[in-house]
């Protein structure tokens, strides 16, 4: 377990947050488009 704790780094956390934000924006956009098309 030499590097066990260091996998939970702030830089990794920031990347995860950026991905989540991007996915939320894309999915939100698709949902709006679907509602609009109805």
């Amino acid at each position: 377990h030499s590097d066990g704790i260091f996998t939970d780094s702030y830089s990794r956390y920031r990347k995860q947050m950026a991905v989540k934000k991007y996915l939320a924006a894309v999915l939100g956009k698709r949902y709006k488009q679907r509602v609009k098309n109805k």
Epitope: H1, S2, G4, I5, F6, D8, S9, Y10, Y13
Partner: antibody, heavy 113, light 110 residues
């Protein structure tokens, strides 16, 4: 994403006490959580950490006095085995492996007879 | 256990001025850069400022600057504002999965 500590209270010396850290917005399966304490008017003191796999590591002074355990996917406990008056402090839970980027507000433990 | 020594323990400077805080570690931090800085005001939990020696956390003004590597690190706060008055701590992560905090530096803004 946030963390919150609970369980702090007034205890007499030698009475075991368990503090709980509850996380929200993320899972402990991908996080390392530390316990840090701060005696009144003093600096921050690292107690120990539990990694995403449940492995625990402690400051050498804390090894025999504290036990950290994961009790669910959202809770981590800190057990004070036999508190002394020297353990009077605010106890913080913080996320991150050696860099502590999400902190709770802390819970106050007072050890007094 | 590793020991982190912060100097000075207290520093005073005028609004608009600059303060420098040093943090020396008794052993090299993980990857030579696993050193972070925190700001704490009375009655509050610490606020994460800088990670991996020199990177600013989200929302932290660029007036805060971290530098250093291995065992010697520095936090510089320029263009001081009244709100910067606080106690600052360094923290290190080390091989063997242990961590530690410096003793803290009180910054007084005049």
């Amino acid at each position: 994403q946030s963390v919150e500590e609970s369980g702090g209270r007034l205890v007499t010396p030698g009475t075991p006490l368990t503090l709980t850290c509850t996380v929200s917005g993320f899972s402990l399966s991908s996080a390392a959580m530390s316990w840090v304490r701060q005696a009144p008017g003093k600096g921050l003191e690292w107690i120990g950490i539990i990694d995403d796999s449940g492995n625990t590591y402690y400051a050498s002074w804390a090894k025999a006095r504290f036990t950290i355990s994961k009790t669910s996917s959202t809770t981590v406990d800190l057990k004070m085995t036999s508190p002394t008056t020297e353990d009077t402090a605010t106890y913080f839970c913080a996320r991150g492996g050696g860099e502590f980027f999400i902190w709770g507000p802390g819970t106050l433990v007072t050890v007094s007879s | 256990d590793p020991v982190l020594t912060q100097t000075p323990s207290s520093v005073s400077a005028a609004v608009g001025g600059t303060v420098t805080i040093n943090c020396q570690s008794s052993q090299s931090v993980y990857n030579n850069k696993w050193l972070s800085w925190y700001q704490q005001k009375p009655g509050q939990s610490p606020k994460f400022l800088i990670y991996q020696a020199s990177n600013l956390a989200s929302g932290v003004p660029s007036r805060f600057k971290g530098s250093g590597s291995g065992t010697q690190f520095t936090l510089t706060i320029s263009d001081l504002e009244c709100d910067d008055g606080a106690t600052y701590y360094c923290a290190g992560g080390y091989r063997g999965n242990v961590c530690g905090f410096g003793g803290g530096t009180e910054v007084v803004v005049k």
